[in-house]
């Protein structure tokens, strides 16, 4: 699959699964075309990650068409932001991070604002809404979850997100983009160098981007467990 995938060309707005080292294939959208004049991003697309609302530059070999690949890569997993991303790519594919400013390269054409009346029961799955708000979250990502923690860790879901856990920092979710988030979540590290320097701020309370590979082996288990406790996409037992 990857061989034919290398030849694939994408256009703005295309939905894909994007692969970064240490990350699962992540639901994403092509936001900008390659700019040949800029050496560092030549032949690389700017990709917007659903769920985390972060961006990165990736080459076509790391991009996989969404519709063709969703059976293979579209299984929910416990990475922070991943399952929210699966929901967004299906239900809200034009979502933009708050404070999002596209650079003046070959970016996607702005779509007109939709009519305010959506279909009954909010049944219109594909809309053209563009978010707009003042908040800008800090860019942080989480560590990879280790396979040994897979079983028994999938315990947090909507309605069970605020379980009391000594390992969950009280301010793990910080919508105002303050510095304390970086201090609180020390296990989280910035995205790899390929990520755009002025990349899109993640949304308040969002899961973090596709996680980077672990750097310190001895802390793996403890940190993965901590991550599980913090992750909005991981369900826990009802405490009430």
């Amino acid at each position: 699959m990857s061989r034919s995938n290398r030849q694939k060309e994408y256009k703005c707005g295309d939905l894909v699964f994007a692969k970064m080292k240490g990350y699962p294939h992540w639901p994403a959208r092509i936001d900008e075309m390659p700019e040949a004049a800029v050496k560092s991003t030549a032949n690389k697309y700017q990709v917007f990650f659903f769920g985390t609302h972060e961006t990165a530059f990736l080459g076509p070999k790391d991009l996989f068409p969404y519709e063709e690949s969703k059976e293979k890569f579209g299984k929910p997993n416990k990475r922070k932001g991943f399952s929210e991303g699966l929901w967004e790519i299906e239900n809200n594919p034009t979502v933009k991070a708050s404070g999002y400013q596209s650079s003046q390269k070959k970016s996607c054409v702005e779509e007109p604002e939709p009519e305010p009346e959506a279909a009954e029961g909010d049944g219109d799955k594909k809309g053209n809404a563009e978010g707009s708000s003042d908040e800008e979250g800090k860019l942080v990502i989480d560590e990879p979850a280790k396979e040994k923690n897979e079983k028994g860790a999938l315990k947090r879901r909507a309605g069970d997100l605020l379980e009391d856990s000594p390992k969950r920092p009280k301010e793990a979710e910080n919508p105002e983009g303050e510095e304390k988030e970086a201090a609180t979540l020390e296990v989280e590290r910035p995205l790899p160098m390929e990520v755009e320097k002025n990349s899109t701020p993640s949304e308040p309370g969002s899961g973090r981007g596709p996680p980077q590979e672990e750097e310190e082996e001895e802390d793996e288990e403890e940190e993965a467990t901590k991550e599980d406790a913090e992750a909005p996409g991981i369900r826990d037992h009802e405490s009430l």
Epitope: K75, P76, S83, E84, L86, W87, E88, N91, S98, G121, D122, G123, G131, S133, E135, R157, A158, G159, D160, L161, L162, E163, K170, A172, E173, P175, E203, P204, G205, S206, G207, P232, G233, R235, S239, L240
Partner: antibody, heavy 120, light 106 residues
């Protein structure tokens, strides 16, 4: 296209048991991450969440109504059933079912609602 | 239980006005907050999820913000079709809605 539709009696007597059915299309309750919730709204009042059932049969109930509620699903029929015992006139409301995703998103798809009146 | 308190309970504003509706949770809900719009005789519609993300098809004049226990929904320029009742909803511990804010034209 995701659609949900509630059905059941429009009138029940006090002390009786209400049984409501939510029939949906466009998704499956056998799909990982999917849930269906029931929410009600008395005339002129606020929304009140009642119960949620997940694809894996993990259920949640409103604590103040838990003893009266049961939520079940029939995956093959694409249906979720809510039963509410010992109905009282204060339970008169429009009852909605809605689809929910396992993770951090809202009730994105709702049925049109069905008005249930409790009266003798 | 987590209680959600909206203010004001009703609000009159002129077309073109900037309108803000507040929602306070009885405990920190870590941004697990949604906003819904409901028009008479209709089911609610999801407007904003995860504190500030606009749902599909929602005009960009709507925005959400907040943290901890305090959240708000803002309409930057009120339009006739925005007349409705707005509900906040937390989903951190089970699900609870605010009592609603009825928005009317002045």
């Amino acid at each position: 296209q995701i659609t949900l539709k509630e059905s059941g009696p429009t009138l029940v007597k006090p002390t009786q048991t209400l049984t409501l059915t939510c029939t949906f299309s466009g998704f499956s309750l056998s799909t990982s991450g999917i849930g269906v919730a029931w929410i009600r709204q008395p005339p002129g009042k606020a929304l009140e969440w009642l119960a949620t059932i997940w694809w894996d049969d993990d259920n949640r109930y409103n604590p103040s109504l838990k003893s009266r509620l049961t939520i079940t699903k029939d995956t093959s029929k694409n249906q979720v059933v809510l039963t509410m015992t010992n109905m009282d006139p204060v339970d008169t409301a429009t009852y909605y079912c809605a689809q929910i995703y396992d993770y951090a998103v809202g009730f994105a798809y709702w049925g049109q609602g069905t008005l249930v009146t409790v009266s003798s | 239980d987590i209680q959600m308190t909206q203010s004001p309970s009703s609000l009159s504003a002129s077309l073109g006005d900037r309108v803000t509706i507040s929602c306070r949770a009885s405990q920190d809900i870590s941004n697990y907050l949604n906003w819904y719009q409901q028009k008479p005789g209709k089911a609610p519609k999801l407007l904003i999820y995860y504190t500030s993300r606009l749902h599909s098809g929602v005009p960009s004049r709507f925005s959400g913000s907040g943290s901890g226990t305090d959240y708000s929904l803002t309409i930057s320029s009120l339009q006739p079709e925005d007349i409705a009742t707005y509900y906040c909803q937390q989903y951190g511990k089970l699900w609870t809605f605010g009592q609603g804010t009825k928005l009317e034209i002045k």
